[in-house]
């Protein structure tokens, strides 16, 4: 009888260990990626930033994948996504073709199954950066709550990439899972 | 036999109550701190803001500590940190020392063990606040996901503190724990 | 005896199913509401934006209610609230009434029990949108962590609604529950 009870308890314990694991949401996915500002291509009004750090400084990733410049979702869920993008220019950096700048960020989602890209969030500002001032700076922050499916990819596009602030505290994006999909 | 079963069940119940508590992450820490307008430093230089409300209006704190102008982490974990900083100037307040302003926020982390300070997030903008307009306003928002250890301290530095908007809906910062460290 | 053990186990299982449900925070409430561009008020005055999508594109809602232009809380808790508001103007849209603009957002909470409205968060900027540039753009992002009670309502007010960017990736607000109230 005692043996039987232990077996029953083991079943209970086992099922609740599973539940406990699930209550931690399979080790809740997250990522915080900081800019690697080397070798950003040009040629379009907005360019995709493909080089980010995920394993140094503030950069980190867990239960998500970073590949080919994209943050890949490994686990279905609702995620809070965010991005902080800083632009700057100093007179010693050379001139600007125009004082009127469009400083923008676009957080996009790509589905591999249906090869299409959609903008989830955008932000930014048109700025008048006059040569009368030796230094200019501007930051954008966007954030929002989105349903993401395994295999979907998040990427960051910006205008004027040559003006990006390359500091890890300045230009970054990230995600963390908040809850499962019902 | 029945007594023995109850004892077994109590053991199961006990362990799961612990698990339940842990699944609530020991009452998940958070803080939302609003600016204390009576104690804003003057000047245009970069300063640490040390006076915040944690127990009135929107200000609140739980399982974190506020001391000496710093938000102290009591529980290891991954936290979402955020700050919203508003600057404003009205012509009735007198002239600005310069029309070219650098309005910035820096969210910093200090480790007591290794007495060093690191900027986690920065944001802001250079602004030209001309005398042609009677009122000027600008807000910065930053947010990001960071690993914080017990004893580490979060503080806020700004430039031009004398231009801060003292409203609780304008100038605040906060944190909430999202998940444990594996 | 074996029957009795099963009954005991069922009790354990039942109570833990409740706990499991609770550990999912009764299906954690959230909302992400995107602007309904067909119904944006005109003018430059401060207005409440009452028309949002909750069931198309990125718009979604769960365990919260959207009614009369307000996001209604159904479940007590601590929530992270956010808003992203984009303003834009192209010269082809005609002249602006003034080049000096105040582009602002206010996230407000209304309690029906005590019929009063309070601003939780505000952000924005004064802008000089000169005719020398053909296009102007500006985005605001605010976010913060707030205690919300069932029945309380969240709404968005902006200045210069006629300048709002009607894209779903541009102008939106949302909320997600992070934890219970102790």
């Amino acid at each position: 009888g005692s043996q039987h009870i232990r077996a029953e308890k083991a079943m209970v314990d086992g099922s609740w260990l599973d539940l406990a694991k699930r209550s931690k949401l399979e080790a809740q996915p997250f990522a915080h990626l900081t800019i690697n500002a080397t070798d950003i291509p040009s040629g379009s009004h907005k360019v995709s930033l493909s080089s980010w750090y995920h394993d140094r400084g503030w950069g980190k990733i867990s239960n998500m994948t970073f590949s080919n410049g994209k943050l890949i979702v490994n686990q279905d869920g609702f995620y809070y996504l965010y991005a902080n993008i800083c632009f700057r220019h100093h007179e010693t950096s050379g001139d600007l073709a125009t004082e009127y700048l469009q400083l923008m960020v676009y957080v996009t989602k790509t589905s591999i199954k249906i090869p299409s890209s959609h903008t989830l969030m955008k932000g930014g500002s048109t700025k008048y950066w006059s040569g009368n001032s030796e230094f200019h700076f501007y930051s954008i922050n966007v954030g929002g709550f989105f349903k993401l499916r395994s295999g979907e990819e998040i990427s960051i596009e910006v205008s004027n990439p040559s003006l990006l602030d390359p500091d890890q505290d300045a230009t970054y994006f990230g995600a963390f899972k908040v809850r499962d999909i019902d | 036999g029945s007594q023995h079963i109850r004892a077994e069940k109590a053991m199961v119940d006990g362990s799961w109550l612990d698990l339940a508590k842990r699944s609530k992450l020991e009452a998940q820490p958070f803080a939302h701190l609003t600016i204390n307008a009576t104690d804003i430093p003057s000047g245009s230089h970069k300063v640490s803001l040390s006076s915040w409300y944690h127990d009135r209006g929107w200000g609140k704190i739980s399982n974190m500590t506020f001391s000496n102008g710093k938000l102290i982490v009591n529980q290891d974990g991954f936290y979402y940190l955020y700050a919203n900083i508003c600057f404003r100037h009205h012509e009735t307040s007198g002239d600005l020392a310069t029309e070219y302003l650098q309005l910035m926020v820096y969210v910093t982390k200090t480790s007591i063990k290794i007495p060093s300070s690191h900027t986690l997030m920065k944001g802001g903008s250079t602004k030209y606040w001309s005398g042609n307009s009677e009122f000027h306003f600008y807000s910065i928002n930053v947010g990001g996901f960071f690993k914080l250890r017990s004893g580490e301290e979060i503080s806020i530095e700004v430039s031009n503190p004398s231009l801060l908007d003292p409203d609780q809906d304008a100038t605040y910062f906060g944190a909430f724990k999202v998940r444990d460290i594996d | 005896g074996s029957q009795h053990i099963r009954a005991e186990k069922a009790m354990v299982d039942g109570s833990w199913l409740d706990l499991a449900k609770r550990s999912k925070l009764e299906a954690q409430p959230f909302a992400h509401l995107t602007i309904n561009a067909t119904d944006i008020p005109s003018g430059s005055h401060k207005v409440s934006l009452s028309s949002w999508y909750h069931d198309r594109g990125w718009g979604k809602i769960s365990n919260m209610t959207f009614s009369n232009g307000k996001l209604i809380v159904n479940q007590d808790g601590f929530y992270y609230l956010y808003a992203n508001i984009c303003f834009r103007h192209h010269e082809t849209s005609g002249d602006l009434a003034t080049e000096y603009l105040q582009l602002m957002v206010y996230v407000t909470k209304t309690s029906i029990k005590i019929p009063s409205s309070h601003t939780l968060m505000k952000g924005g900027s004064t802008k000089y949108w000169s005719g020398n540039s053909e296009f102007h753009f500006y985005s605001i992002n605010v976010g913060g962590f707030f205690k919300l009670r069932s029945g309380e309502e969240i709404s968005i007010e902006v200045s210069n609604p006629s300048l709002l960017d009607p894209d779903q990736d541009a102008t939106y607000f949302g909320a997600f529950k992070v934890r219970d109230i102790d």
Partner: antibody, heavy 123, light 107 residues
Framework: EVQLVESGGDLVKPGGSLKLSCAAS????????MSWVRQTPDKRLEWVAS????????SYPDSVQGRFTITRDSAKNTLYLQMSSLKSEDTAMYYC????????????????WGAGTTVTVSS | DTVLTQSPATLSVTPGASVSLSCRAS??????LHWYQQKSHESPRLLII???QSISGIPSRFSGSGSGTDFTLSINSVETEDFGVYFC?????????FGGGTKLEIK
């Protein structure tokens, strides 16, 4: 039709000064950065000066820094290059060119060129 | 300064042949490279921007490729009107610099 027409080229002695002009038409002059590019007798191209659309940024290579000044008058749709302390190595065909970019305002390619004006520095 | 080296200095071809012109940068310039054509007694004309983007009004036989330090301008089936000098120019870093040019002449 988008057009740039340079004028003011001449024969000048070393140490002398000269002012070149470039009249722009067919596009909104005030919305573009502008540059001067010269072509030396050995057919090499050298960027000489740039000015931003609003005229607040100017830049020069080390070879002409302090001697050349680029300016613009958007009301007259005209670009200028004031050259002083001229040297024999400044002898070249001077082209006025419209500066353009797609991605970053720090970029620069020249999508419209004038026919050029000849500057000869010789004693 | 970023030095652009073009090769060959001169290329003799017969009309109808296809050719490749090289431009090498002294340091990585990503894709911030542009190509110009200059016919005898004319001003330069923009052909390709950002290494590979064609310009409106330029014949499709002109194409560009490359990234980093090595770039190529290709002309598929050269026509008589294509003879002249070809220059590359970088806009990755200040000051903007041009290559020495490749002269395409009739064989």
């Amino acid at each position: 039709e988008v057009q740039l027409v340079e004028s003011g080229g001449d024969l000048v002695k070393p140490g002398g000064s000269l002012k070149l002009s470039c009249a722009a038409s067919g596009f909104t002059f005030s919305r573009y950065g502008m540059s001067w590019v010269r072509q030396t007798p050995d057919k090499r191209l050298e960027w000489v000066a740039s000015i931003s659309s609003g005229g607040t940024y100017t830049s020069y290579p080390d070879s002409v820094q302090g001697r050349f000044t680029i300016t613009r008058d958007s009301a007259k749709n005209t670009l200028y290059l004031q050259m002083s302390s001229l040297k024999s190595e400044d002898t070249a065909m001077y082209y006025c060119a419209r500066r353009n970019f797609i991605t970053s305002a720090t970029d620069c390619y020249f999508d419209v060129w004038g026919a050029g004006t000849t500057v000869t520095v010789s004693s | 300064d970023t030095v652009l080296t073009q090769s060959p200095a001169t290329l003799s071809v017969t009309p109808g042949a296809s050719v490749s012109l090289s431009c090498r940068a002294s340091q990585s310039i990503s894709n911030n490279l542009h190509w110009y054509q200059q016919k005898s007694h004319e001003s330069p004309r923009l052909l390709i921007i950002y290494a590979s983007q064609s310009i409106s009004g330029i014949p499709s036989r002109f194409s560009g490729s490359g990234s980093g330090t090595d770039f190529t301008l290709s002309i598929n089936s050269v026509e008589t009107e294509d003879f002249g000098v070809y220059f590359c120019q970088q806009s990755n870093s200040w000051p903007f610099t041009f290559g020495g040019g490749t002269k395409l002449e009739i064989k």
